[in-house]
């Protein structure tokens, strides 16, 4: 048995007569043979669940659920209750109604076995019938909403009449009906005004019924019509077995370049028309087990369960359902030498499902793990300016498919054939497993005999020590020009275009800083700034070369303070700035300020 509502409301007036009917509570059956019996909690409660007094005023008919006044609630009784309400004005009291024998002790009042009945207290006598407005004659102030469990026997769940009004104003004629489309499973009996279900409901067909209750009251020779929403929610039970959408029970996957722990290798989706068990219980009650196979597979893979609520269309309305994604995930990094093919089976069990049929599914994953070979092109040819500054990025080396790699740790090294011309360095980028070539020794670069640099690039997989090699030929171009005196170490210091472009700075491939003109649109990613190379700085990312020295690109790498209009980068640098941003790496400070339009003109005039 269960209540069709978790709360009821009615009004109480001073000196209302004993015997006045107040309202009906309704219970619905879970099984056809059940017979409801209602029991009132012993106490009246007030604000913040304060227990006020033993209930001596209101009784219930155990078989019908009718609550009525056993004795009149006079001023002194109300004063008595008010005193115990922790100093708050007592406007509302409530009672607990239990369904026997569900709850035998008065504890927490939880639906479905308990409902609260709230009484709004009015410190006046019941108003004259003629003064009652149609709204007051028709419906309680608080709109009811109803809960009906699916697949349960039909039954009465509401009675429209306001009993105190009917009792005290018998000459007022009130009629009710439900506005609903054809074929809906509800009926309002014209004589008793009881609302009942015509048949058992199916939540998977319809979950919410937004009905409208219509009340018609005589007003002279006219009728006033009052309409209120009458929402019914159908509560779910686990009556649907899990299924495969479109019958897909097998997923095939190839593990090749993505070999990192936690990589999702394949996903299979399971659909369940139910939304129970609820999210808190779901993972415990909806289990997935990777069936024992070989030990290697058990150690290498795990299954992750990702349930998600979705909505599906049923009979023109949307109802909630659950999709369960079962992801086959790498439990560890896989070596590039691994080479296997296997079939994995996962048992999914909806343990709450009662049938008919089984709540169990078998998921199949066909997995091929392919080995990865390291290949480099036979030769790389690059050029570098003699004016390039230290940490200038001049190119990239990359084993075949390196951009696609994850979980593969490749290290790059350079072996110089001419010991005195060892100008370049290489660092491995964590992002795409490439090697970034940069100027490491500017002195060697300026030597006239170092016009052509020959290197061997060696790529090594750290786990297996497998290697790949390539020739690297670097042509040194241009002639060296000494920098003007007083130029800062970092391009980022310069605040104006002219001073920016006449100096060089760490990381500059041409020996000159570059000015990036912003778009001037408030706090923007495209702020104006001075950079060693606009290709790499700023780009919102502090790369592996830029980490070598804070002077290269503080716009991307600074961890210090940024003054002025800006949005900080994650985890460092300037994500967006206002106007022009310049930085003082030694002081660990950047400034973003409005652009000074007159500056270039002044610079020209002052020359």
């Amino acid at each position: 048995l269960y209540f069709s509502r978790d709360a009821y409301w009615e009004k109480l007036y001073v000196d209302q007569a004993a015997g006045t009917p107040l309202l009906y509570v309704h219970a619905l059956r879970d099984a056809p043979e059940e017979v409801p019996s209602f029991r009132l909690g012993q106490h009246l409660y007030g604000t913040y669940r304060t227990r006020l007094h033993e209930n001596n005023w209101i009784c219930i008919q155990e078989d019908t659920g009718l609550l009525y006044l056993n004795r009149s609630l006079d001023h002194s009784s109300w004063e008595k209750l008010s005193v115990r309400n922790r100093g708050f004005p007592l406007l509302t009291v409530y009672l607990k109604v239990f369904l026997s024998p569900t709850s035998l002790r008065e504890g927490e009042c939880q639906w479905p076995g308990c409902a609260r009945v709230y009484f709004s207290f009015f410190n006046t006598s019941f108003p004259a019938c003629s003064s009652l407005k149609p709204r007051e004659l028709c419906f309680p102030e608080t709109r009811p909403s109803f809960r009906i469990r699916e697949n349960r026997p039909p039954g009465t769940f509401h009675q429209f009449r306001l009993l105190p009004v009917q009792f005290l104003c018998p000459n007022i004629s009130v009629a009710y009906r439900l506005l609903e489309g054809e074929g809906l499973p509800f009926r309002c009996a014209p004589d008793s005004l009881e609302v009942s279900t015509r048949w058992a409901l199916d939540r998977e067909q319809r979950e919410k019924y937004e009905l409208v209750a219509v009340c018609t009251v005589h007003a002279g020779a006219r009728e006033e019509v009052v309409m209120v929403p009458f929402p019914v929610t159908v509560y779910d039970e686990d009556d649907s077995a899990p299924t495969f959408p479109a019958g897909v029970d097998t997923a095939s996957a190839v593990v090749e370049f993505k070999r990192k722990e936690d990589t999702v290798v394949a996903t299979l989706r399971v659909f369940d028309a139910d939304v129970v068990p609820a999210s808190g219980e779901l993972v415990r009650r909806y289990t997935s087990t990777l069936l024992p196979g070989d030990t290697w597979a058990q150690q290498t893979f795990r299954v992750e369960h990702w349930p998600n609520e979705t909505s599906v269309q049923a009979n023109g309305s949307f109802v909630r359902a659950t999709v369960h994604d079962y992801r086959l995930v790498l439990n560890r990094n896989l070596s590039i030498s691994e080479n296997r093919t296997m079939q994995l089976a996962v048992l999914v069990n909806d343990s709450d499902f009662q049938g008919p049929g089984a709540g169990v599914l078998l998921l199949h994953f066909n997995v091929s793990v392919l080995p990865v070979s390291l290949h480099l092109p036979s030769t790389y040819s690059l050029s570098v300016s003699r004016r390039a500054r230290r940490f200038a990025q001049i190119g990239k080396v990359c084993v075949e498919n390196c951009q696609a790699f994850s979980g593969i740790n490749v290290q790059y090294k350079l072996h110089s054939s001419g010991a005195n011309c060892s100008t370049l360095g290489v660092v491995t980028s964590a992002e795409d497993t490439s090697g970034i070539l940069f100027v490491n020794d500017t002195k060697a670069l300026r030597r006239p005999k170092c016009a052509e640099l020959h290197y061997m690039v060696v790529a090594t997989d750290q786990q297996t020590s497998r290697q790949a090699q390539a020739q690297l030929l670097v042509t040194v171009e241009g002639s060296y020009v000494a920098e003007e005196a007083g130029c800062p170490l970092s391009c980022a210091v310069s605040k104006r275009r002219l001073e920016c472009e006449e100096c060089g700075g760490l990381g500059s491939p041409t020996g000159r800083c570059e000015w990036r003109q912003g778009d001037g649109k408030g706090i923007t990613r495209n702020f104006s700034t001075c950079s060693p190379s606009t290709k790499t700085c700023p780009d919102g990312h502090c790369d592996v070369v830029e980490t070598q020295d804070i002077n290269i690109c503080p716009q991307d790498c600074l961890r210090g303070s940024i003054v002025g209009g800006h949005e900080p980068g994650e985890p460092r640098g300037i994500k967006a700035g206002y106007g022009t941003c310049n930085c003082f790496p030694e002081e660990e400070k950047c400034f973003c300020e409005p652009e000074d339009i007159q500056d270039p003109l002044c610079d020209e005039l002052c020359r």
């Epitope: 407005k133 004629s173 020779a221 006219r222």
Partner: antibody
Framework: DVQLQESGPGLVAPSQSLSITCTVS????????VHWVRQPPGKGLEWLGM???????DYNSALKSRLSISKDISKSQVFLKMNSLQTDDTAMYYC???????????WGQGTLVTVSA | DVLMTQTPLSLPVSLGDQASISCRSS???????????LEWYLQKPGQSPKLLIY???NRFSGVPDRFSGSGSGTDFTLKISRVEAEDLGVYYC?????????FGGGTKLEIK
């Protein structure tokens, strides 16, 4: 489309009874009340009585003893019965539907009843 | 019973003129629920009456905005701002606040 249609005998002898039927379509008599109004030739409108959606009735005070209104919801019909007709009961008899609190929004076309020997 | 008295009995007007019809009740027709169920109907020769105004001042759907109703308590007025040929006929006020409801005697709007 809401429609009301009166049908009556046309001619009634003095002291005899009158029975008029109002057949409705486009709405249910369980949801709307129906009124009867008459209009003697060249005169004004006179309210006769009504039947509420619940089936209860109200009548014109002066005619109460001679009037009876009933309905058959399943047949969508409302009936007016009037006893002891006199020549001054000669009139066009209308049925009209109450549109909630907005008044007589829908009327029949009327049926002429002549009381004459 | 509530007696509804309409004046004038006949109202000759020129097309385009304003017309005003008065209706007075023998007692207040404010219902205890606060509403006043005062309506105006127009009956053209050989036709059934048509609803124009309900609850004193609300125009029924399809009624031109040259028709307006006003008043309270016991005194009510129907105004036609610019009379057109199709407005000619007999106008009736009606009170539905008290049972039995009652019609006024009617006002005939005709061409001067």
């Amino acid at each position: 489309d809401v429609q009301l249609q009166e049908s009556g005998p046309g001619l009634v002898a003095p002291s005899q009874s009158l029975s008029i039927t109002c057949t409705v379509s486009g709405f249910s008599l369980s949801r709307y009340s129906v009124h009867w109004v008459r209009q003697p030739p060249g005169k004004g409108l006179e309210w006769l009585g009504m039947i509420w959606l619940g089936g209860s009735t109200d009548y014109n005070s002066a005619l109460k003893s001679r009037l009876s209104i009933s309905k058959d919801i399943s047949k969508s019909q409302v009936f007016l019965k009037m006893n002891s007709l006199q020549t001054d009961d000669t009139a066009m008899y209308y049925c009209a539907r109450n549109l909630d609190s907005r008044g007589f929004a829908h009327w029949g076309q009327g049926t002429l009843v002549t009381v004459s020997a | 019973d509530v007696l509804m008295t309409q004046t004038p009995l006949s109202l000759p007007v020129s097309l385009g003129d304003q017309a005003s019809i008065s209706c007075r009740s023998s007692q207040s027709i404010v219902h205890s629920n606060g509403n006043t169920y005062l309506e105006w109907y127009l009956q053209k020769p050989g036709q059934s009456p048509k609803l124009l105004i309900y609850k004193v001042s609300n125009r029924f759907s399809g009624v031109p905005d040259r028709f307006s109703g006003s008043g309270s308590g016991t005194d009510f007025t129907l105004k036609i701002s610019r009379v057109e040929a199709e407005d000619l006929g007999v106008y009736y006020c009606f009170q539905g606040s008290h049972v039995p409801p009652t019609f006024g005697g009617g006002t005939k709007l005709e061409i001067k």
